[in-house]
Interface confidence: low
């Protein structure tokens, strides 16, 4: 029987060009975590394996950093990064636990735009 629960950072927002930490935590189970997959919709971002450590998908290696812990740090955010992210915990003997995070990447504030393009 699967007794565990996944806690996530939930719905979060960050500014374009910035970075954000995606975090999940599995609790209420004694199951052994063998691997955690981080996925964005149908794309694999990264894998953290209990024995082999981290593997970052080649297409994301310039913008994704492992950690802290089993979390994932996304860097150089773009508006296209907006969407659902999933942490998938593979455990034994329980099975698979999945957590969902929604990230919204916002344009820089109007004030910043105004200051940046102000005509002297």
């Amino acid at each position: 029987m699967m007794t565990g629960t996944i806690e996530t950072t939930g719905n979060i927002s960050a500014e374009k060009g910035g970075s954000i930490i995606l975090q999940c935590h599995l609790s209420s189970t004694t199951a052994q975590v063998t691997q955690v997959n981080w996925e964005q919709q149908d794309q694999l971002l990264a894998i953290c394996n209990a024995d082999l450590g981290w593997h970052i998908s080649p297409s994301f290696k310039d913008r994704v950093a492992p950690g802290p812990g089993l979390g994932l740090t996304l860097q150089s955010l773009t508006v296209n990064d907006t969407g659902e992210y999933f942490c998938i915990y593979h455990t034994y003997p329980d099975g698979t636990y999945t957590g969902r995070i929604f990230l919204e990447v916002l344009e820089s504030s109007v004030a910043e735009h105004g200051a940046r393009f102000q005509i002297p």
């Epitope: 063998t34 691997q35 894998i47 024995d51 082999l52 593997h55 003997p93």
Partner: nanobody, 123 residues
């Protein structure tokens, strides 16, 4: 090309023992986790045991704990499944499989498979 070749299957009486071998080639054996699965006639393929690439971590299905032992010899590129106290319900085709991110216990997490070796436990 990855190749996994199982051997060691056969007919054995209840309570007997067998040792299955899985010879691997085509990849860096020590960087992959190895798993054993089995499929009985008319049933789905099920997880039996797995061992991490380092050999430190091992995993077993509840039905074989205490009776089966998985091991690996990196120098021989071979994984083993020592099966003791065999029961008729252990009768199945046994497959070995490799995973670069294992050890995991779902068959979908393993990318390469052997052709299988038949184990029959009967008096």
């Amino acid at each position: 090309e990855v190749q996994l070749v199982e051997s060691g299957g056969g007919l054995v009486q209840p309570g007997g023992s067998l040792r299955l071998s899985c010879a691997a080639s085509g990849f860096t054996f020590g960087h992959y986790a190895m798993g054993w699965f089995r499929q009985a006639p008319g049933k789905e393929r099920e997880f039996v045991a797995a061992i991490s690439w380092s050999g430190v971590s091992t995993y077993y299905a509840d039905s074989v704990k205490g009776r089966f032992t998985i091991s690996a010899d990196n120098s021989k590129n071979t994984a083993y499944l020592q099966m003791n106290s065999l029961k008729p319900e252990d009768t199945a085709v046994y497959y070995c499989a490799s995973s670069p991110y294992g050890p995991l216990y779902r068959s979908t997490h393993y990318y390469d498979w052997g052709q299988g070796t038949l184990v029959t436990v009967s008096s």
